[in-house]
């Protein structure tokens, strides 16, 4: 196993309706076709993993159809987005990025991006 | 779109330097990560160098790594490649590429790049 470099964002706030997109890049240091990139989050010194995807370059990322992220790739970045978040899940998202194929084996782990969730305020009763 | 001109080619002799220079125009070079690339022969293109957007980050394959070093200036739009202890193993067509990237990092895989020049060779022989 080779260490790779991963850049990501320090912070980033969720949106009101839970939506936070940060970019992940990573230093390839050759010419992988196939690269696996992870959200891990922690939170109370416990890592879990969020969602994964393993995609062939020039192609879509493609997460599970019950993932909770969507992304897209360029080059050597991955644009990532993760939905549904609430305030409960406000923690550090890590981006860990695996280059699979061809040999040699790759991975990088980022520092991670610390994403604020703010729950809307309920709207107030109108009498109208 | 940003253009690249690669410049500084030529005949040099084994143990020779040189340096290249990947000039661009259309953009500023400062938002894109630069690789140089090489291709002798019938041969496949090979990786040699690349650099980040702000020049803090620096990759180089095993083939080269103490003999060449890129650098990059931004004021002038220009990404340097110096070669020292140069081989006959060198003798390349040399091409320099351009990525947009948000943060200081670079790849070394021509996959990822999207902008390319027309290359300039480079003949180490006696």
């Known amino acids: 196993c080779k260490a790779m470099h991963v850049a990501q964002p320090a912070v980033v706030l969720a949106s009101s309706r839970g939506i936070a997109s940060f970019v992940c890049e990573y230093a390839s240091p050759g010419k992988a076709t196939e690269v696996r990139v992870t959200v891990l989050r922690q939170a109370d010194s416990q890592v879990t993993e969020v969602c994964a995807a393993t995609y062939m370059m020039g192609n879509e990322l493609t997460f599970l159809d019950d993932s909770i992220c969507t992304g897209t790739s360029s080059g050597n970045q991955v644009n990532l987005t993760i939905q549904g978040l609430r305030a409960m899940d406000t923690g550090l998202y890590i981006c860990k990025v695996e280059l699979m194929y061809p040999p040699p084996y790759y991975l990088g782990i980022g520092n991670g991006t610390q994403i604020y969730v703010i729950d809307p305020e309920p709207c107030p009763d109108s009498d109208f | 779109e940003v253009q690249l001109v690669e410049s500084g080619g030529g005949l040099v002799q084994p143990g020779g330097s040189l340096r290249l220079s990947c000039a661009a125009s259309?953009?500023?070079?400062?938002?894109?990560?630069v690789g140089w690339f090489r291709q002798a022969p019938g041969k496949e293109r090979e990786e040699v160098a690349c650099?980040?957007?702000?020049?803090?980050?620096?990759d180089y394959p095993g083939s080269v790594k103490g003999r060449f070093t890129i650098t990059r200036d931004n004021s002038k739009n220009t990404v340097y490649l110096q070669m020292n202890s140069l081989r006959a193993e060198d003798t390349a067509v040399y091409y320099c590429?351009?990525?947009?990237?948000?943060?200081?990092?670079?790849?070394?895989?021509?996959?990822?790049?999207?902008?390319w020049g027309q290359g300039t060779q480079v003949t180490v022989s006696s």
């Open positions: 259309g953009d500023t070079l400062e938002s894109f990560a």
């Open positions: 590429a351009a990525e947009r990237l948000v943060f200081h990092l670079c790849s070394l895989s021509e996959y990822d790049y999207d902008t």
């Open positions: 650099i980040g957007r702000t020049g803090e980050f620096t």
